[in-house]
Interface confidence: low
């Protein structure tokens, strides 16, 4: 009779994680008598997966009834496959011996590869904000996928990016893999509402890629532009100077007024106007009692934005010769109008200016007397 052959018809089997894998094995003869065993790997380090003779293998079931007379099918099914189950499986026939069974013949092996989905991509941006025209890096990570082949793309507002570098680890063969990609993005002033997207395509996703996103609002700082102007006033001894702080992001902003270099008032931006591009505007104003000054006044609007170094804009307030003549040497305390919402300004503004104006004229008159 021909010598027994161990036939493993499939060289490879690919299974999705969580599914069951069927590993086929058949014998060509009933002789010699003895059990079969399944191993993962070959050589001294091989791992026993199933022993027909003894042992408890809860994840392994036999495809046919092995105790059935004349059975030559020794296929097995392994349930709940994970990436750790990947490897080459050998069906091995043993010959009955005393005291131990002796390995007789092995099948050629079936390579089990496990298809595991990548985890949802996690995109992270820079630790510190950067200003427009600067380049920032975003990273994208995904783990636990198999096989190794994977495609990663970066987009900014739907436009594909090209400046990125991607690594799939580990470098050698493994049960599962991780991908790490770093993209470089040049910021523009309009990027407060922009988004970067990391898109991952893998065989396990059946054409429906995974996406991770990050908002550039977390990475950008748009510094403000300042404009200081004098507003027309009804009262002759009053000057209303405004500081328009425009197109800044994020919100955090502190403004200080200085008169001839001396701090007059500090305030924190509260009621902001949001622009279409996501940046903010804010206005502060300073009411100056001009009759309290003999000389021209340099008013400075100094803004500290998002913890950065202060920027400032100055305005020279001219004191007319008539006012200089009536001025005095007493310490000046500017009459300051609080920065208030637009509605309050419109309703109370004229009344407040009238009161302040009359008071100023009275003070000037009293000083003269």
């Amino acid at each position: 009779e021909d010598e027994l052959q161990v036939i493993q018809p499939e060289k490879s089997v690919s299974v999705a994680a969580g599914e069951s894998a069927t590993l086929r094995c058949a014998m060509t003869s009933l002789i010699p008598v003895g059990p079969i065993m399944w191993f993962r790997g070959a050589g001294a380090g091989r791992e026993l997966i199933y022993n027909q003779k003894e042992g408890h293998f809860p994840r392994v079931t036999t495809v046919s009834e092995l105790t059935k007379r004349n059975n030559l099918d020794f296929s097995i099914s392994i349930s709940n496959i994970t990436p750790a189950d990947a490897g080459t499986y050998y069906c091995v026939k043993f010959r009955k011996g005393s005291p131990d069974d002796v390995e007789f013949k092995s099948g050629a092996g079936t390579e089990l590869s496990v298809r595991a989905k990548p985890s949802a991509p996690v995109v992270s941006g820079p630790a510190v904000r950067a200003t427009p025209e600067h380049t920032v890096s975003f990273t994208c990570e995904s783990h636990g996928f198999s096989p190794r082949d994977i495609t990663l793309k970066w987009f900014k507002n739907g436009n594909e990016l090209s400046d990125f570098q991607t690594n799939v680890d580990p470098a050698g063969d493994s049960v599962s893999y991780s991908i790490h990609s770093t993209a470089r993005v040049v910021l523009t002033r309009g990027d407060v509402h922009s988004q970067v997207i990391c898109e991952i395509a893998h065989i396990t996703l059946q054409g429906d890629p995974l996406r991770g996103t990050a908002n550039l609002s977390e990475a950008i700082r748009v510094p403000p532009t300042l404009e200081v102007t004098q507003q027309p006033m009804r009262a002759e001894n009053q000057a209303n100077v405004t500081c328009q702080v425009s197109n800044f992001y994020p919100r955090g902003l502190q403004l200080t007024w200085l008169e001839n270099g001396n701090v007059s008032r500090t305030e924190t931006a509260s009621t902001l106007i949001e622009n279409k591009d996501g940046t903010y505007n804010w206005m502060s104003w300073l009411l100056v009692n001009t009759c309290a000054h003999r000389d021209d006044v340099v008013l400075t609007c100094q803004v500290e934005h998002d913890g950065q170094q202060a920027v400032s804009k100055s305005y020279a307030l001219e004191i007319s010769a008539h006012q200089k003549e009536h001025g005095s040497d007493i310490t000046h305390e500017a009459a300051l109008a609080p920065t208030a919402p637009l509605l309050v300004a419109l309703l109370l503004g004229p009344k407040l200016l009238l009161v302040v104006g009359v008071s100023a004229i009275y003070i000037c008159w009293k000083q003269k007397a």
């Epitope: 690594n167 680890d169 580990p170 470098a171 050698g172 063969d173 493994s174 790490h180």
Partner: antibody, heavy 119, light 107 residues
Framework: QVQLVQSGAEVKKPGASVKVSCKAS????????MHWVRQVPGQGLEWMGW????????KYSQKFQGRVTITRDTSATTAYMELSSLRSEDTAVYYC????????????WGKGTTVTVSS | DIQVTQSPSSLSASVGDRVTITCRAS??????LNWYQQKPGKAPKLLIH???SLQAGVPSRFSGSGSGTDFSLTINSLQPEDFATYYC?????????FGGGTKVEIK
């Protein structure tokens, strides 16, 4: 026994190219990767790239990308490393080393090929 | 890219001493770390692979340990032939990278 035999020393002018060969014997050539590592005189080891001899998958170090080309001829069981646009700082000993497919350790090394770049 | 920092860069020891060289990776690399010995004018020689597996034919006085980011190579009872430069190498991620080397000299 397993061995890697490298081609002889080379002297090249700046801007030229050099091609170093590495003949493998004593093992199944297609079952391993072949790494290329260089060592500038008095300095440490620097990985340049690898080729998986079985499927010709190649990976280069970003530092050499565009200048290095690694190839293999399975029938001749030989790997090649070509470095172009040579500059004086490319003067070094260039090693080929057999690589394991999983941990990517380099268990067998060639004796090295000295490449001198001088005008 | 993963950086591998080796320390010390050099050390002096006597025959019979126990010597330890450390290697730190800039991110976790599991056990994908290998150790090599190089003597002047010679190619490097693999001592340890996968952080702690002794390569065939390497004397048992060499041992490796560690996982994640911190690794070490220990030579128990230093022998005259052990005076050389030792390199660690990470093989977790490309580009593969080597430590700067540790030169073990005779005291």
């Amino acid at each position: 026994q397993v061995q890697l035999v490298q081609s002889g020393a080379e002297v090249k002018k700046p801007g030229a190219s050099v091609k170093v060969s590495c003949k493998a014997s004593g093992y199944t050539f297609t079952s391993n990767a072949m790494h290329w590592v260089r060592q500038v005189p008095g300095q440490g080891l620097e990985w340049m790239g690898w080729i998986k001899a079985g499927n010709a998958e190649i990976k280069y170090s970003q530092k050499f990308q565009g200048r290095v080309t690694i190839t293999r001829d399975t029938s001749a069981t030989t790997a090649y490393m070509e470095l172009s646009s040579l500059r004086s700082e490319d003067t070094a000993v260039y090693y080929c080393a057999r690589g394991d497919y999983y941990y990517y350790y380099m268990d067998v090394w060639g004796k090295g090929t000295t490449v001198t770049v001088s005008s | 890219d993963i950086q591998v920092t080796q320390s010390p860069s050099s050390l002096s020891a006597s025959v019979g001493d126990r010597v330890t060289i450390t290697c730190r990776a800039s991110q976790s690399i599991s056990d994908f770390l290998n150790w090599y010995q190089q003597k002047p004018g010679k190619a490097p020689k693999l001592l340890i692979h996968a952080a702690s597996s002794l390569q065939a034919g390497v004397p048992s006085r060499f041992s490796g340990s560690g996982s994640g980011t911190d690794f070490s190579l220990t030579i128990n009872s230093l022998q005259p032939e052990d005076f050389a430069t030792y390199y660690c190498q990470q093989s977790y991620s490309t580009p593969l990278s080597f430590g700067g080397g540790t030169k073990v000299e005779i005291k």
